[in-house]
């Protein structure tokens, strides 16, 4: 009877990008008073863990702590809620959460094609490159939940590169990029050195408000 109840939420604290051997806590929660949560991990081994729900202030939740992150635990996780002792009466699944292990390979370089200081409205492109033969690059922006990703272009001057067009500049931000290989999408390189992009000729240089929807990975977006 999957989907009897609406889906719970699944969060990662402090975040879904986890350094090797560091701790991450996965939290299932819902405003439905679930007695149990089932945490499911997709991967070579499909694993399901049954967690007891705790009820506080009209919310049910359960935490799963990974004390030392390894490559074997990276993957796509989903959470289900259960209101009875029957494991078959579960809610719809939470949105998938990709837990990625970072810091495994050498860091790529990140640069802004027109330099890190740009005029408001100017089109910004960030380039991520490495001598390592990464198949994919991931660009993250501080304060945003999702990364953009692009395949690495063919080897040029001994490097593999991806160019991220961010559109017209409005607000600055701090960016990082990571490299990964096709066969291990949940295993990323060390972070590039952070790149602070500043926008001049703009009355404000604030962060996006918390209510602003963050773009999904891979969609074109403006530089906020």
């Amino acid at each position: 009877h999957e989907g009897v109840h609406r889906k719970p939420s699944l969060l990662a604290h402090p975040g879904r990008l986890v350094k090797s051997e560091e701790t991450v806590i996965l939290q299932c929660w819902s405003d439905v008073m679930f007695e149990h949560f089932l945490l499911h991990r997709e991967g070579m081994f499909n694993d399901t863990l049954r967690l007891i729900g705790e009820h506080h202030d009209g919310v049910s939740k359960a935490n799963f702590s990974i004390s030392r992150m390894t490559q074997d635990l990276a993957g796509t996780y989903r959470c289900y809620g259960s209101v009875t002792h029957s494991p078959y009466q579960v809610s719809a699944p939470s949105d998938p959460l990709d837990i990625v292990i970072i810091g495994l390979y050498e860091k790529p370089s990140l640069s802004a094609q027109l330099g890190p200081t740009v005029l408001a409205g100017e089109n910004v492109t960030l380039s991520c490159s490495s001598r390592s033969s990464y198949d994919m690059y991931h660009l993250s922006r501080e304060g945003e939940a999702h990364e953009r990703r692009l395949p690495a272009g063919p080897k040029v001057n001994g490097t593999f590169q991806a160019d991220f067009p961010l559109g017209p500049a409005t607000h600055g931000g701090t960016y990082r990029c990571f490299g990964s290989f096709h066969d291990s999408p949940y295993e990323w390189s060390k972070s590039s050195d952070p790149l602070l992009v500043s926008v001049t000729g703009n009355p404000s240089n604030s962060w996006p408000s918390p209510t602003e929807p963050s773009s999904k990975t891979g969609n074109p977006r403006h530089l906020h």
Epitope: E21, R41, F45, L49, I66, S67, M69, D72, D183
Partner: antibody, heavy 117, light 111 residues
């Protein structure tokens, strides 16, 4: 340096069960998969199944489904493989191996199980 | 009968380059990466190559791996007498939902 130490050789009668242990030392036990791989005399390698201790859910090769049980005890950093309804073809060296990404960089020394009447 | 197919034997003289093939299908080698193991008599296998062509630390660069379609190969250049061993390929199989191995190749280094 992670080490996997397995229990000693066993001689079993057909129809009985055997339980082999694999104790890990020198690293995080819970966060790495432990697989069991067997090798019959003069034969190749055969994956039987595996478990990630922190989850506790075992995954089995179709061939062994219903006959093998893989468990893990986080408190003692030990994984177990129990094979039931033994027959002479189950005579083999049984290895535990750690990790799936990359696969099996660390192996136990192997446990010889002989099934004979 | 192994899911992955390897030649039962291979040989070469010291200094030579030898290759060992491993043939599979779309559900294993075709969609997943290939790993190679080296095994000496009476000892546990040792990971030699993972993710098609990656060497764990401590494995000499004389060993290299490659993959194309549903086949893979292990190449050993500058063959040495201590390379005489059994070699196994392995890959995850999406249909069987488990690891599958080749039958193994016995490498002989001729004097």
């Amino acid at each position: 340096q992670v080490q996997l130490v397995q229990s000693g050789a066993e001689v079993k009668k057909p129809g009985s069960s055997v339980k082999v242990s694999c104790k890990a030392s020198g690293g995080t036990f819970s966060s790495y998969a432990i697989s069991w791989v067997r090798q019959a005399p003069g034969q190749g390698l055969e994956w039987m199944g595996g478990i990630i201790p922190i989850f506790g859910t075992a995954n089995y090769a179709q061939k062994f489904q219903g006959r093998v049980t893989i468990t893990a005890d986080e408190s003692t950093s030990t994984a177990y493989m129990e094979l039931s309804s033994l027959r002479s073809e189950d005579t083999a060296v049984y290895y535990c191996a750690r990790g799936v990404r990359p696969p099996f960089p660390t192996w136990g020394q192997g446990t010889l199980v002989t099934v004979s009447s | 009968q192994s899911v992955l197919t390897q030649p039962p034997s291979a040989s070469g003289t010291p200094g030579q380059r030898v290759t060992i093939s491993c043939s599979g299908s779309s559900s294993n080698i075709g969609s997943n990466t290939v790993n190679w193991y080296q095994q000496f008599p009476g000892t546990a296998p040792k990971l030699l190559i993972y993710s098609n062509n990656q060497r764990p630390s401590g494995v000499p660069d004389r060993f290299s791996g490659s993959k194309s379609g549903t086949s893979a190969s292990l190449a050993i250049s500058g063959l040495q007498s201590e390379d005489e061993a059994d070699y196994y390929c392995a890959a995850w199989d999406d249909s069987l939902n488990g690891w599958v191995f080749g039958g193994g190749t016995k490498l002989t280094v001729l004097a």
